[in-house]
């Protein structure tokens, strides 16, 4: 008799998930000498242990602690770039500006980026058919809890001036329900972080509005200032030129406003 399987609203575990995580871990530790000591089999075992045989709506941050411990990594705390709803540009930026780091430039972020995973209660199976959706099913699912855990730790580690890249094309440039708005903002430590600098990325070529005056940016400023952290904001009117000037800062066109 075929065993009844829970149908969730979200997509199932990414195919070849174990192999992908292991391969990414090996690749990352080869490229980053400071992480060469990491045993990728142990990392996979800890990752697997966080969600296998557990109800996928009942995952806690504690479940991920063994993985967090193995993935402990020191990044320069004053070189952190957060992002919200504009991941690709943030990653393009840190690929050029190699001394700055997004969460996905760390081992744990790199392992899980763009992947989905979940298990089933009381079986050692990975569910490749469906996984819980954050809105439609439950928020304490393996993927959401993972990102909440690593995002919290990443924000807590930040110091001095922290940068955040925000998508100026969205109706809510700052969305308090995003990972940045609900986790990272609230875990920047006022004792260490002096300023949060927002970079608002414009979408349209003819868009000359000052998006730093957007009500959602004012809301971000309010949340940040209440934490006793200074706030500043810059419009990035031409993201293509912005990246080009990061690559070639000596270019004569890079002295004008981007």
């Amino acid at each position: 008799v075929p065993r009844w399987r829970q149908q969730w609203s979200g997509p199932g575990t990414t195919k070849r998930f174990p192999e992908t995580v292991l391969a990414r871990c090996v690749k990352y530790t080869e490229i980053h000498p400071e992480m060469r000591h990491v045993d990728c089999q142990s990392v996979w075992d800890a990752f697997k242990g966080a969600f296998i045989s557990k109800h996928p709506c009942n995952i806690t941050e504690e479940d991920y602690q063994p993985l967090m411990k193995l993935g402990t990594q020191t990044v320069p705390c004053n070189k952190i770039l957060l992002w919200s709803r504009i991941k690709d540009l943030a990653h393009q930026f840190t690929q050029v500006q190699r001394d700055m780091f997004t969460l996905e430039d760390t081992l744990l972020g790199y392992l899980a980026d763009d992947l989905t995973w979940c298990g089933e209660f009381n079986t050692s199976k990975i569910n490749y058919q469906s996984c819980p959706d954050w809105r439609k099913d439950c928020s304490n699912n393996p993927v959401s809890v993972f990102w909440k855990t690593v995002s919290r730790r990443f924000a807590e580690a930040a110091c001095d001036v922290v940068h955040v890249m925000l998508n100026g094309s969205r109706s809510k440039i700052f969305d308090k329900n995003s990972t940045f708005g609900s986790v990272e903002v609230h875990n920047l430590q006022p004792e260490k972080v002096q300023t949060l600098e927002a970079w608002v990325i414009h979408g349209g070529r003819e868009d000359s509005r000052d998006l730093c005056q957007d009500p959602t940016i004012k809301e971000l400023e309010s949340i940040i200032s209440k934490r006793n952290i200074q706030f500043s904001c810059k419009n990035i009117y031409r993201p293509d030129k912005f990246l080009q000037c990061v690559k070639n800062p000596e270019d004569s066109s890079c002295t004008s406003e981007i």
């Epitope: 609900s182 986790v183 609230h186 875990n187 009500p215 004012k218 949340i223 209440k226 934490r227 006793n228």
Partner: antibody, heavy 125, light 109 residues
């Protein structure tokens, strides 16, 4: 509306928990929910606030840290736990909502627009 | 923290009264004014330094200021304006002793 409860006559050194219950709105829209006290014949004294969108953002007056704890206990209740009470803590305790001031519930300092009637805490020996 | 002056002021009906509030650091115009009458909770009058809080608040109440210096002006004072007025900063909740000023009692003659 807001209503505070839990005020009482207590002895020095005692602990007490006050509850603030919201009706007509809930915390699924994010607010700063604040506690303010007023000793008899004195001015308003800010105790602290909790951002209802994140339990990581709780703020206290410097004098209140350690002895006072603010928590969101449900989508309509916030509590204030007080310990090691002294006669100086005798006051009316108010719960207040720091309202959103922009469109679509953006919070950027709209002031405390909604207050409870207050609950009296008396510390006596 | 917030320094409010004067502590008490007497004003005749129809007169004008100004209450000042000084912040220890810039508060970005995130300042509110409240009116409190005996036995009642405070009532929000003005937010963001100059915006009237609700349609029920009389336009006789006017807020102004920026940076660290703010003023509440009540013109055409009425008997019903007799109350204690408080300013409150909403800019930073870190390392704050009191977000409220000490209060100003307005006595109407």
């Amino acid at each position: 509306s807001l209503e505070e409860s839990g005020g009482d006559l207590v002895k020095p050194g005692a602990s007490l928990t006050l509850t603030c219950t919201a009706s007509g709105f809930d915390f699924t829209t994010y607010y700063y929910m604040c506690w303010v006290r007023q000793a008899p014949g004195k001015g308003l004294e800010w105790i602290g606030c909790i951002y209802t969108g994140s339990s990581d953002s709780i703020y206290y007056a410097s004098w209140a840290k350690g002895r006072f704890t603010i928590s969101k206990t449900s989508s309509t209740t916030v509590t204030l736990q007080m310990s090691s009470l002294t006669a100086a803590d005798t006051a009316t305790y108010f719960c207040a909502r720091d309202r959103p001031s922009g469109n679509d519930d953006y919070i950027y300092d709209g002031g405390m627009d909604l207050w409870g009637p207050g609950t009296l805490v008396t510390v006596f020996s | 923290d917030m320094t409010q002056t004067p502590a008490s002021v007497e004003v005749a009906v129809g007169g004008t009264v100004s209450i000042k509030c000084q912040a220890s650091q810039t508060i970005n115009s995130w300042l509110s004014w409240y009116q409190q009458k005996p036995g009642q909770p405070p009532k929000l009058l003005i937010y963001q330094a100059s915006k009237l809080a609700a349609s029920g608040v009389s336009s006789r109440f006017k807020g102004s200021g920026s940076g660290t210096e703010y003023t509440l002006t009540i013109s055409g004072v009425e008997c019903a304006d007799a109350a204690t007025y408080y300013c409150q900063q909403g800019y930073s909740f870190g390392n704050v002793d009191n977000a409220f000023g000490g209060g100003t009692e307005v006595v109407v003659k």
